[in-house]
């Protein structure tokens, strides 16, 4: 395969193997996978230390590493097309064996974004520096390599193999050699923990001098989560050595008989296990029976135990596990209560903010306060809300009812305000007359004037404008002007505008008079009033959006 197992470290429920060999990340992963593992994860500082230990073991044996800065693949990769996410510790990379996004990271430098190709992570080792637990290998990101071209400075890779449990190393009470063969095909004579399903071959004796006695054991699950070899008593015991060789293979005490035989024993507070070698605490808490953050508390005389939960948690029916207390059951908050693991928090409804007397109290937000009013014009604060209002000549508009839109009095409900032409302005309107007519002093009616062929008379001066309240002068029942074929205004009996339903969007071209042009013979079409125009949505200037009718008496703003 182009890779040799040089080192192995087993700890907890996993073994890490370090391999030298210039392989691509895919080839390295395939090598780990063939033996039931994956490229190693480094999900915590502790795991980083385990990986560092196995690399240190490899480097002690490996003299031929070619680069001063060596890189070893780990199982952190980012697929092609998946972009960098700077907000995450893993920056959008994920562990090849699956699993959650973990909080630990140790990037060598700021990553450059590149989504074009697959990217892989290696551990960067400076071989000129000693490997210290305080100086953990940095993560280096780069191309994943290809067969025959692993990438710059790639010297090897680290695999991880997970197991349901581990056995303790076998205890030798006399001369002999243990060889462990792991499920991932590594052989070793010194493992601090031996993975489940490993085989142990024990050859007793001192080479050719003694006839060798051999034993074969398997690391198996003897009871739920109890992993053991099933051997009884120390192995390779010899009357020649008694307790002098490796403490007789005993875990704690070794007691010699007069005939060279010996027995293992335990210190006070411990008991000898079935293997007749290992001691376990008599303390019932030593087996960690409590779960979920519960603390084991010894009972009187150390006979039994109870589990105790941290604040905000209580024991479940098993009396071993802690479950969250739902503090919200007691209604500790004025408005909203959110239960959280081990506690709770109070929240306020929309329109309120934390404050006022007492824990979890809420007070009204004054949305109308200076500098924060959401309304375009008038704002009235209410308890937990507010509403907006508009000045004369405007109605509330906008999705949230906070904007004010000019009322087009020229097409408003209740019929026309002007006898003839009507010019809408922001917040007001003006009347005008057709050629040959002049505006009466009341600003609404038209009287016959000297014949003129010019454009319709424009808006009167400021002092002549129609009153917003509406004139008391009776309106003339004149025909509405429309366009003649030649483009000059002519009178027709009536024209009716389609009635508008209040929820229909208005997309038709505007009818609003934008003010007559100053150039002779050219004028823009005025809004022509029609008694038949239904009250309902009115087009805003420009005619390209629909605004629902709003009452002018103010409307609650949307929070």
């Amino acid at each position: 395969t182009g890779a040799d197992t040089e080192a192995v470290v087993c700890v907890g429920t996993a073994c890490y193997t370090a391999h030298s060999g210039k392989l691509s990340a895919a080839e390295a992963q395939n090598h780990c996978n063939q033996n039931g593992g994956n490229l190693a994860t480094v999900k915590s500082k502790e795991e980083a230390q385990h990986v560092q230990r196995v690399l240190a073991q490899l480097l002690r044996r490996e003299a031929a590493l070619t680069a001063r800065m060596s890189k070893f693949w780990i199982g952190l990769q980012r697929e092609k097309g998946k972009c960098l996410d700077p907000s995450l510790p893993l920056k959008g990379f994920s562990w090849v064996g699956g699993g959650e996004d973990t909080p630990y990271s140790n990037w060598h430098k700021e990553l450059r974004n590149s989504c074009i190709s697959k990217r892989c992570v290696s551990l960067l080792l400076d071989l000129s520096q000693p490997l210290l637990p305080s100086r953990l290998p940095k993560w280096s990101e780069g191309p994943c390599g290809s067969p025959g071209s692993p990438g710059s400075n790639i010297e090897g890779f680290v695999c991880k193999f997970s197991f349901k449990g581990m056995c303790r190393p076998l205890a030798l009470g006399g001369p002999g050699q243990v060889t462990y063969t792991t499920p991932f095909q590594t052989t070793s004579s010194s493992l601090e923990a031996v993975p489940f399903a490993s085989a142990a071959n024990v050859a007793c004796g001192e080479g050719d001098k003694d006839e060798t006695q051999s034993h074969y054991f398997l690391c198996k699950e003897k009871a739920p989560d109890v992993f053991d070899w099933g051997s009884s008593g120390p192995l390779c015991v010899s009357p020649k050595y008694g307790c002098n060789f490796n403490n007789g293979g005993c875990h704690q005490d070794c007691f010699e008989g007069g005939d060279g035989s010996f027995l293992c024993g335990c210190r006070p507070g411990f008991r000898l296990l079935d293997d007749l070698v290992t001691c376990a605490s008599r303390n019932p808490c030593s087996s960690s029976p409590c779960r979920g953050g519960a603390t084991c508390v010894l009972g009187p005389h150390g006979k039994n135990y109870t589990c105790r939960c941290p604040q905000g948690y209580q024991l479940d029916s098993s009396q071993l596990d802690c479950v969250d207390v739902d503090e919200c059951q007691d209604s500790p908050c004025a408005q909203e209560c959110v239960n959280t693991p081990g506690g709770f928090r109070c929240e306020c409804w929309v329109g309120y903010e934390p404050g006022g007397p007492g824990e979890g109290a809420c007070q009204d937000v004054d949305e109308c306060a200076l500098g924060r009013s959401p309304c375009a014009q008038g704002c009235t604060n209410t308890d937990g809300s507010f509403h907006c209002s508009c000045e004369e000549g405007y109605v509330l508009a906008g999705e949230d009812g906070t904007q004010c839109q000019d009322v087009d009095e020229c097409v408003g409900p209740g019929g026309p305000l002007c006898d003839s032409l009507c010019f809408n302005t922001q917040g007001s309107f003006h009347c005008g007359c057709l050629p040959g007519w002049v505006l009466a002093p009341n600003g609404v009616s038209c009287t016959m004037g000297p014949v003129s062929l010019g454009p319709p008379s424009g808006p009167p001066d400021e002092e002549d404008k129609g009153e917003k309240e509406g004139s008391t002068v009776p309106r003339a029942a004149t025909a509405s002007p429309t366009r003649g074929p030649e483009g000059t205004p002519k009178a027709t009996p009536t024209t009716s505008r389609p009635s508008l339903s209040s929820d229909a969007p208005i997309t038709s071209a505007p009818l609003k008079m934008l003010a007559p042009s100053g150039s002779p013979g050219v004028w823009r079409e005025p809004s022509i009033h029609h008694a038949t125009a239904a009250s309902g949505p009115q087009e805003p200037a420009g005619g390209d959006s629909s605004v629902a009718t709003q009452n002018n008496d103010g409307t609650d703003g949307q929070k």
Partner: antibody, heavy 118, light 112 residues
Framework: QVQLQQSGPELVKPGASVKISCKAS????????LNWVKQRPGKGLEWFGR????????DYNGKFKGKATLTADKSSSTAYMQLRSLTSEDSAVYFC???????????WGQGTSVTVSS | DIVMTQAAFSNPVTLGTSASISCRFS???????????LYWYLQKPGQSPQLLIY???NLASGVPDRFSSSGSGTDFTLRISRVEAEDVGVYYC?????????FGGGTKLEIK
Amino acid sequence: QVQLQQSGPELVKPGASVKISCKASGYAFSSYWLNWVKQRPGKGLEWFGRIYPGDGDTDYNGKFKGKATLTADKSSSTAYMQLRSLTSEDSAVYFCVRGDGYWAMDYWGQGTSVTVSS
Amino acid sequence: DIVMTQAAFSNPVTLGTSASISCRFSKSLLHSNGITYLYWYLQKPGQSPQLLIYQMSNLASGVPDRFSSSGSGTDFTLRISRVEAEDVGVYYCAQNLELPWTFGGGTKLEIK
């Protein structure tokens, strides 16, 4: 499919020994615990002991300590239980039972009846 | 050793109705890994026992879903929702938490 085939009934005299067998098929014999369970006539079930054929590791119920020796032959996928110094108390049906990965006794042999009588 | 207590006989049940069999242990069977190592076996007349339920509430292969089991660390109940004639026999609870493995005395299901 998994099968456990036990040897036939035995009629033995008090003080004698008997060796009963259990031939396994349909699974990796070396990798599962093989349990022996005793059932006296009209009575309940009692766990007698077990063997791990992979390395011959055994565990016995202290109540029956010294009464039996459990062995296994990997080449023939057969487990044996030798009972010694038989008394009428040992008259029972003995079942061999596979222990699975969930610690359940999932497959049972048909049982071997041992009758101790003079 | 862990000791379990079972009633020798169930209350006689009518076919099609439900039945409950209970079992009490001298020690909690809930392991610190969160698994409860309780098992139920049925021995029909003249047959070898068969596994019904493993690890407190999991149905063994081929067992109809009329069977269910529940309980806490020490008290457990096997329920048969609609008893059929083929359900008659002796029901044993067992623990595989600690050696030696132990069985309850067995409860005989009786039909009215």
